[in-house]
């Protein structure tokens, strides 16, 4: 079958890194600079991806494979094949359309990306707060109050936020 197909279609003989040039009697021509073909039998070469601005080159383009990009420091990749770059924030912040904003009281983010998440509610598991939460860290839950021996005490749970808003700077 392969032999039959190659007799019928001379382009099927063109390997990756070349294209079947109709202007030159279907001769296999090398891909021009800044282009590639990753499979054989192609009639055109694809333009190489350019990694510029928010993107930087992770792997150079070759005649047989596209360039691969990642993000310039200060940003991180999103999407398949790093199709987008998104701004990093500090721990204790989340990214909004207004830029990086501090987590509201009662929420935390321990990463440079993602959203602020509510502190764990220890009382739902019948436990007490051992270590208070911060903008950067979740609360640490301890044993339930009943498990504590007489005279021992746990850290008082944080007071609820009076109103929505960002933590004091």
């Amino acid at each position: 079958f392969e032999r039959t197909r190659s007799l019928q279609d001379p382009c099927s003989n063109c390997p990756a890194g070349t294209f079947c040039d109709n202007n030159r009697n279907q001769i296999c021509s090398p891909c021009p600079p800044n282009s590639f073909s990753s499979a054989g039998g192609q009639r055109t070469c694809d333009i190489c991806r350019q990694c510029k601005g928010v993107f930087r080159t992770r792997k150079e383009c070759s005649s047989t494979s596209n360039a691969e990009c990642d993000c310039t420091p200060g940003f991180h990749c999103l999407g398949a094949g790093c199709s987008m770059c998104e701004q990093d924030c500090k721990q204790g912040q989340e990214l909004t359309k207004k830029g990086c904003k501090d987590c509201c009281f009662g929420t935390f983010n321990d990463q440079k990306r993602g959203i602020c998440r509510p502190w764990t509610n220890c009382s739902l598991d019948g436990k007490s707060v051992l270590v208070n939460g911060t903008k950067e860290r979740d609360v640490v839950c301890g044993p339930s109050p009943a498990d504590l021996s007489p005279g021992a005490s746990s850290v008082t749970p944080p007071a609820p936020a009076r109103e929505p808003g960002h933590s004091p700077q």
Epitope: G53, F75, E86
Partner: nanobody
Framework: EVQLVESGGGLVQPGGSLRLSCAAS?????NYWMNWVRQAPGKGLEW???????????YYVDSVKGRFTISRDNAKSSLYLQMNSLRAEDTAVYFC????????????????SGQGTTVTVSS
């Protein structure tokens, strides 16, 4: 081909002004949020400002608030950054960047940016 081309950079004294431009082509400019980001020498990339599709929402990093103004002209497929009261710390390569599909809804990713234009603030 989707393209963004920045211009307008140069050498300016502290306290001076510059207006950066970004010419967009290959896509429907008026459908996208647009951004300016910058990279100071030896530093990481920093987001500077963004503007929504019709120009009714504009946001800035704290360090440029009251000094920089982002604007756009959808008829000309152009983005601008008016920079006043420039400081030495504004020295950087400035990039125009497009907010990807769904920007502001489920992400704040940038999917296309230009080669950049260099702004140097020095006496």
């Amino acid at each position: 081909e989707v393209q963004l081309v920045e211009s307008g950079g140069g050498l300016v004294q502290p306290g001076g002004s510059l207006r950066l431009s970004c010419a967009a082509s290959g896509f429907t400019f008026s459908n996208y949020w647009m951004n300016w980001v910058r990279q100071a020498p030896g530093k990481g990339l920093e987001w500077v400002a963004n503007i929504n599709q019709d120009g009714s929402e504009r946001y800035y990093v704290d360090s440029v608030k009251g000094r920089f103004t982002i604007s756009r002209d959808n008829a000309k497929s152009s983005l601008y950054l008016q920079m006043n009261s420039l400081r030495a710390e504004d020295t950087a390569v400035y990039f125009c960047a497009r907010g990807g599909e769904g920007y502001g809804i489920d992400h704040y990713g940038l999917d296309v940016s230009g080669q950049g234009t260099t702004v140097t603030v020095s006496s």
